[in-house]
């Protein structure tokens, strides 16, 4: 038997994927455990099987189907369940009835690229990736820029309180290295949290002009 | 295997109120959603509400928030639909229906006919 | 409310025939649409769920495609237990909505 708190979080990325995480206090030895997805009017279920990712917590993607499809709605509620070997039986350690779009978490942005680069500021632009259409334009981004000698924690957060994939970093300085880093959340949902940052997207402003002699 | 059977055919006035039964069986009753549509003569359908019998959740459509109650008895496996206020144009049949998939399987109907 | 679009309302077809009736969400509804076909003083019978995916028992020459907001439903060879009256359904979000109906009548 396993003693101890538990903690079981999941998300939906709005498309095909429950990412969750389980977390026990008690000791569990070499035991095997599974997340089982059971949604309330679905003609399907789903399992996956829980890994260890530290001394006390395991993690699982649901993958639904294909990455773009659509496999939940606003009206779907899926049980989740944790469940444990325990000799020839499973038993149910964690449950939860999981509403998708009350616990929502996107993938990261894709695509960065740099569109214009001059001395003093820098036009980025991304993609989202695997979003609902549900959304339709109810999305929020935040990004940040590293600059030399500062830590990604340091870095002033920029909020783009609507669907705008492009930014125009300013008052950047010239001939200088930077980073950028993007991360997307849906207006919608109770529980919902900003997707993991993107990948960052590194670019070198130009330098200044040289003065003419006189 | 999977049953809906619903009771019999009403006559109401305008104004009255009528309770329509629909009693499941073949299956787990508490796990799946039961729909009520209904249809007009020679009319399309439409949705009415929903019930989920094992934890009484219920979600109505917006038309009819006020008019129609749903309920249902566990120890009887049978979802209930009361529509209260009614008028002509509430003359229809009206059906419950089985959410897996979609809407899977189907009450006969129950015919109500509102008239003065 | 999403409105779904059925067309033709009605159609005249022979025995063998290959039919198509097309129904258009006035929104993205993914592939949570189901065809239903019903016969007069009967209830609907569900024939598709997911857009694609037939219900068992239901013959093969009925299928269904589609996604977004654009959905078919094909009788490849028509039979005389065939002509009804079919209905679209949408099921992705609140108030479910349907389908005004195609008669599918003998010619």
């Known amino acids: 038997a396993v003693n101890g708190t538990s903690q079981f979080t999941c998300f939906y990325n709005s498309r095909a994927n429950i990412s969750c995480v389980w977390s026990q206090d008690g000791a569990l030895q070499d035991t095997s455990c599974q997340v089982h997805a059971w949604p309330d009017r679905r003609r399907w279920n789903q399992t996956c099987e829980l890994l260890p990712v530290s001394q006390a917590s395991w993690a699982c993607n649901l993958i639904l189907g294909a990455p773009d499809s659509q496999k939940l709605t606003t009206v779907d509620i899926v049980t989740l369940r944790v469940l444990c070997r325990e000799g020839v039986r499973w038993r149910v350690m964690a449950i939860q009835d999981f509403k998708p779009f009350e616990n929502l978490r996107l993938m990261a942005p894709i695509s960065l690229q740099v569109v214009h680069v001059e001395t003093h500021r820098c036009n980025i632009s991304w993609e989202i990736s695997q979003a609902s259409h549900y959304f339709e334009r109810h999305l929020e981004f935040e990004a940040r820029t590293l600059s030399p000698g500062h830590t990604w924690e340091e870095a002033p957060l920029l909020t783009l309180k609507q669907k705008q994939e492009w930014i125009c970093l300013e008052t950047l300085t010239p001939d200088t290295q930077y980073e950028f880093q993007v991360r997307v959340k849906p207006l919608q949902g109770e529980f919902t949290t900003w997707s993991p940052w993107s990948q960052p997207l590194a670019f070198r402003t130009k330098p200044a002009a040289l003065g003419k002699d006189t | 295997q999977v049953q809906l059977v619903q009771s019999g055919a009403e006559v109401k006035k305008p104004g009255a109120s009528v309770k329509v039964s629909c009693k499941a069986s073949?299956?787990?009753?508490?796990?799946?959603?039961i729909q009520w549509v209904r249809q007009a003569p020679g009319q399309g359908l439409e949705w009415m509400g929903e019930?989920?019998?094992?934890?009484?959740?219920?979600n109505h459509n917006e038309k009819f928030q006020g008019r129609v109650t749903m309920t249902r008895d566990t120890s009887t496996s049978t979802v209930y639909m009361e529509l209260s206020s009614l008028r002509s144009e509430d003359t229809a049949v009206y059906y419950c229906?089985?959410?897996?998939?979609?809407?899977?399987?189907w009450g006969q109907g129950t015919t109500v006919t509102v008239s003065s | 409310d999403i409105q779904m679009t059925q067309s033709p309302s009605s159609l005249s077809a022979s025995v063998g025939d290959r039919v198509t009736i097309t129904c258009k969400a006035s929104?993205?509804?993914?592939?949570?649409v189901a065809w239903y076909q019903q016969k007069p003083g009967k209830a609907p019978k569900s024939l598709i769920y997911s857009a694609s995916y037939r219900y068992s028992g239901v013959p093969s020459r009925f299928s269904g495609s589609g996604s977004g907001t654009d959905f078919t439903l094909t009788i490849s060879s028509l039979q005389p237990e065939d002509f009804a009256t079919y209905f679209c359904h949408q099921y992705s979000s609140y108030p479910f909505t349907f389908g005004q109906g195609t008669k599918l009548e003998i010619k």
């Open positions: 929104q993205n509804v993914g592939t949570d």
């Open positions: 229906t089985r959410h897996y998939g979609s809407f899977d399987y």
């Open positions: 019930i989920l019998p094992g934890s009484g959740s219920i």
């Open positions: 073949g299956y787990t009753f508490s796990r799946y959603w």
